[in-house]
């Protein structure tokens, strides 16, 4: 699987999950999030050669098409597969609120 | 929606579904598919600016991050959202077989 266990331990050029730390205040301008200050959102990148973690029959077909027609602009793209939530603390006036934001952390990638 | 109805009628630079005809024999080397000769597989391409058909909270966050950090390599990618099947005819020896291949035709795209 193209997950953090594999991708963070290997120098992988092809589609894989990459570490990306985002600081809420500095990178997003979100001053309203009090905890955490930031988090590892991660991201997916790298080429998608034929059959590499193909998401659907279409991505398999497109990968083969791209292999046999290398000048073509159509090719699968490396995108998130498994995502995890992130729990944040913020305030509404003086009242603290805790909320779980879904799909915030990329754990693995796929070619789609 | 970034679907064929919209994308095929507009000159859209950003993420959208694009027409792509694939000939099974010529483009994939699949001699075994007898009908159809080919089909419109289509594909997704184009930049994913902030909030454009964002698939998840992560893609929204990444789009904003990319807007505020334009030098960053991390950005959402334009990939298939809705896909449709394709029915094909092939032969196993002298016995005809009809099969519905799932997820063969891209009907709309998203930023993921």
């Amino acid at each position: 699987a193209l997950d953090t266990n594999y991708c963070f331990r290997n120098l992988e050029e092809n589609c894989c999950v990459r570490p990306l730390y985002i600081d809420f205040r500095q990178d997003l301008g979100w001053k309203w999030v009090h905890e955490p200050k930031g988090y590892y959102a991660n991201f997916c990148s790298g080429p998608c050669p034929y059959l590499r973690s193909a998401d659907t029959t279409h991505s398999t077909v497109l990968g083969l098409y791209n292999t046999l027609n290398p000048e073509a602009s159509a090719s699968p793209c490396c995108v998130p597969q498994d995502l995890e939530p992130l729990t944040i603390l913020y305030y509404v006036g003086r009242t603290p609120k805790v909320e779980q934001l879904s799909n915030m952390v990329v754990k693995s990638c796929k070619c789609s | 929606a970034l679907d064929t109805n919209y994308c095929f009628r507009n000159l859209e630079e950003n993420c959208c579904v694009r027409p792509l005809y694939i000939d099974f024999r010529q483009d994939l080397g699949w001699k075994w598919v007898h009908e159809p000769k080919g089909y419109y597989a289509n594909f997704c391409s184009g930049p994913c600016p902030y909030l454009r058909s964002a698939d998840t909270t992560h893609s929204t966050v990444l789009g904003l991050y990319n807007t505020l950090n334009p030098e960053a390599s991390a950005s959402p990618c334009c990939v298939p959202q809705d896909l449709e099947p394709l029915t094909i005819l092939y032969y196993v020896g002298r016995t005809p077989k009809v099969e519905q291949l799932s997820n063969m035709v891209v009907k709309s795209c998203k930023c993921s």
Epitope: - | H34, T87, Y91, G93, R94, T95, P96, V98
Partner: antibody, heavy 119, light 111 residues
């Protein structure tokens, strides 16, 4: 250009044997099924024998009229298909065509070779 | 085995005539939207020639005056305007199951 060249036909006595050959060129012989179709004088077309590709284990078919007497075989290294005809009868007299069916239709045909069974 | 019955078995027509030949199968030769019936032209001393494949698709190099239609058990070959070179015997053939079989043929003669 697809070419199918039959040979081996001729005059043979009842009970005798003949081996027809069909040399193919211009297509991927290994990938396709090959057939022998005949036309007896004043009759229609009849599929007498058929052999599919290696992918499908060289499965063969024979019409009831030739079963246990005729044998179809192929040599992929020579791109040739054969029809071994034993215990020939007068009713086997016909023009025998070699043909290739990439799908469900016989797309290409040889020029035919005449087999005459007569005493 | 699937039997194919062609009608008529022979017909006389003139150059320019519209000619229709039918082929009826003893059971359906269609699967899903695919119609597994094919048509051939056979002239004396020549090899048969594929005209139409899968009911309605014109084979390579065949003039557009030839057309095919039908589904299930009933199929038709039409020559819109008969030409001198079209006088021949026409056969239908199915590939719905093994064994593939031919129809008895329809001889098109000059009136």
């Amino acid at each position: 250009e697809v070419q199918l060249l039959e040979s081996g036909g001729g005059l043979v006595q009842p009970g005798g044997s003949l081996r027809l050959s069909c040399a193919a060129s211009g297509f991927d012989f290994n990938s396709y099924g090959m057939s022998w179709v005949r036309q007896a004088p004043g009759k229609g077309l009849e599929l007498v024998a058929d052999i599919v590709s290696k992918t499908y284990n060289y499965t063969t078919y024979y019409s009831d009229s030739v079963k246990d007497r005729f044998t179809i075989s192929r040599d992929n290294s020579k791109s040739t298909v054969y029809l071994q005809m034993n215990s020939l009868r007068a009713e086997d007299t016909a023009v025998y065509y070699c043909t290739v069916a990439p799908g469900g239709s016989f797309d290409y045909w040889g020029q035919g070779t005449l087999v005459t069974v007569s005493s | 085995d699937i039997q194919l019955t062609q009608s008529p078995s022979s017909l006389s027509a003139s150059v320019g005539d519209r000619v229709t030949i039918t082929c009826r199968a003893s059971q359906s030769v269609s699967i899903s939207r695919f119609n597994l019936m094919h048509w051939y032209q056979h002239k004396p001393g020549k090899q048969p020639k594929l005209l139409i494949y899968r009911a309605s698709n014109l084979a390579s190099g065949i003039p557009s005056r030839f057309s095919g239609s039908g589904s299930g058990t009933d199929f038709t070959l039409t020559i819109s305007s008969l030409q001198p070179e079209d006088f021949a015997t026409y056969y239908c053939q199915h590939s719905r199951e093994s064994p593939w079989t031919f129809g008895g043929g329809t001889k098109v003669e000059i009136k």
